[in-house]
């Protein structure tokens, strides 16, 4: 296609991770333009012909779709002309991992910037005190990973102790045969300390702390995408 | 404000068809999915397919696969949907209704009025 | 395609009750499921969509929850305009498919 342009504008894209079977953004953002008719977005995917999505004339052109997105994307279009150019991809899946391009054409110029997109599965992890063990344990359950992480345990009065000899771990296949749900036992736990569950794979890393009283047990539990940013 | 204004009740012979239409206005007719629903009388609600009117590209029920034609006319604003070989079992409440979300379909958020097509001999 | 098992069929209530309509999917996951309250006579309405994001407009008593294949819609203190039919959507996949219903009435 013909470019209006002739300068280069900044096009800037994110790496970021998609949760299997739930919304997932593919994050890009130039140069605004004012005039929304004159911008062009084109997403594109590597060993994939034809088009992600494309934006043009102030709305959606899905002429060149590829079937497998169709019904699955969106651009944010009230943001088209702030310069938001992000795809919005409905019920994420295994094969939508690789490497996109996000190509912007305006009036001002035109320019593109590549984005790599991982997908799996994460959640955050549930930790309780397991009431039904012959010594007092502590049970971290999370619902769904993919691929299948490690987990590790910390505590804040045993900096640097190794768990692995107290706790037990075990990977359950949920029923789309594809995520695991992760269950993580850890035994012979002392009272006023602070214990933690940590869930790692290649996509995120998913802590859960727990501190347990006399009187209370007080939660708080993270969940933080991997190598995320631009 | 998304209005879906559906054709008026419709009396057919088993055998015949009938196309039932859906106008639409307060939107963008060309950037959201629109779909047909039905609910045979006391009976509960049967997804029959939907259309991105931008394209024209359609999806269907296995169930109505052959017998239903869901089609668009952008020049009217107005979304389709035909149902042919028509038997008894066909009487039912025909809706439209808009998918949220533009090219993303989405769920269906506004719906028409609804139409009776009534299938009797 | 995905089928949604809903449950119960119907089920008698007074106001102020908490009432709880459960939805199972046939398989897999994914967190596209829709509620939606229908009146006699009138089209169906939206109340919920991707499992709990309450529709604009939509009293706060009404709440979605679920993960897996089980996917639920609460009620928290029934009030006389909420007695009418309930259905669930499975709108994640190619083919959309409608839970078969639940009544909700007065006891």
């Known amino acids: 296609f013909g470019i209006s342009g002739k300068h280069f504008i900044t096009v800037t894209t994110f790496t970021s991770a998609g949760n299997i079977g739930e919304d997932g953004t593919l994050s890009c953002t130039f140069e605004p333009d004012i005039k929304l008719n004159g911008i062009v977005i084109q997403w594109l995917k590597e060993g994939i012909k034809g088009l992600v999505h494309e934006f043009k004339e102030g709305k959606d052109d899905l002429s060149q779709q590829h079937e497998m997105f169709r019904g699955r994307t969106a651009v944010f279009a009230d943001q088209v002309v702030v310069g938001n150019a992000s795809l919005r991809l409905k019920n994420v899946q295994l094969t939508d991992a690789g490497t996109y391009t996000c190509y912007i054409r305006t009036s001002k110029g035109k320019g593109n910037a590549n984005l790599e997109y991982k997908t799996g599965a994460f959640s955050m992890p549930e930790i309780n005190v397991d009431y039904n063990a012959s010594s007092e344990s502590l049970r971290c359950e999370a619902p769904r990973w993919f691929p299948q992480p490690t987990v590790a345990w910390a505590s804040q009065v045993d900096q640097g102790a190794n768990f692995s000899e107290v706790s037990n771990t075990s990977f359950e296949l949920n029923s789309e045969n594809v995520t695991m749900k992760v269950v993580s036992v850890l035994y012979n736990v002392t009272i006023n300390n602070t214990y933690s569950c940590m869930i790692e794979n290649d996509i995120a890393k998913a802590t859960g702390d727990i501190k347990v009283t006399d009187s209370e047990v007080k939660r708080r539990s993270q969940l933080q995408l991997l190598n995320s940013g631009p | 404000e998304v209005q879906l204004v559906q054709s008026g009740a419709e009396v057919k012979k088993p055998g015949a068809s009938v196309k039932v239409s859906c106008k639409a206005s307060?939107?963008?007719?060309?950037?959201?999915?629109i779909g047909w629903v039905r609910q045979a009388p006391g009976q509960g609600l049967e997804w029959i397919g939907d259309?991105?009117?931008?394209?024209?590209?359609?999806n269907y029920n296995e169930k109505f696969k052959g017998r239903a034609t869901i089609t668009r006319d952008t020049s009217t604003s107005t979304a389709y949907l035909e149902l042919s070989s028509l038997r008894s079992e066909d009487t039912a409440v025909y809706y439209c209704?808009?998918?949220?979300?533009?090219?993303?379909?989405?769920?269906?958020?506004?719906w028409g009025q609804g139409t009776l097509v009534t299938v009797s001999s | 395609d995905i089928q949604m098992t809903q449950s119960p069929s119907s089920l008698s209530a007074s106001v102020g009750d908490r009432v709880t309509i459960t939805c199972k999917a046939s398989?897999?996951?994914?967190?596209?499921v829709a509620w939606y309250q229908q009146k006699p006579g009138k089209a169906p309405k939206l109340l919920i969509y991707?499992?709990?994001t309450l529709q604009p407009g939509v009293p706060s008593r009404f709440s979605g929850s679920g993960s897996g294949r089980d996917y639920t819609l609460t009620i928290s203190s029934l009030q006389p305009e909420d007695f009418a039919t309930y259905y669930c959507?499975?709108?994640?996949?190619?083919?959309?498919?409608f839970g078969q219903g639940t009544k909700v009435e007065i006891k």
């Open positions: 209704a808009r998918l949220d979300g533009s090219s993303y379909r989405g769920a269906m958020d506004s």
């Open positions: 307060g939107y963008t007719f060309t950037s959201y999915w």
């Open positions: 259309i991105y009117p931008g394209g024209g590209y359609t």
């Open positions: 398989q897999g996951f994914n967190k596209y």
């Open positions: 991707y499992t709990s």
């Open positions: 959507l499975q709108y994640g996949n190619l083919l959309y498919a």
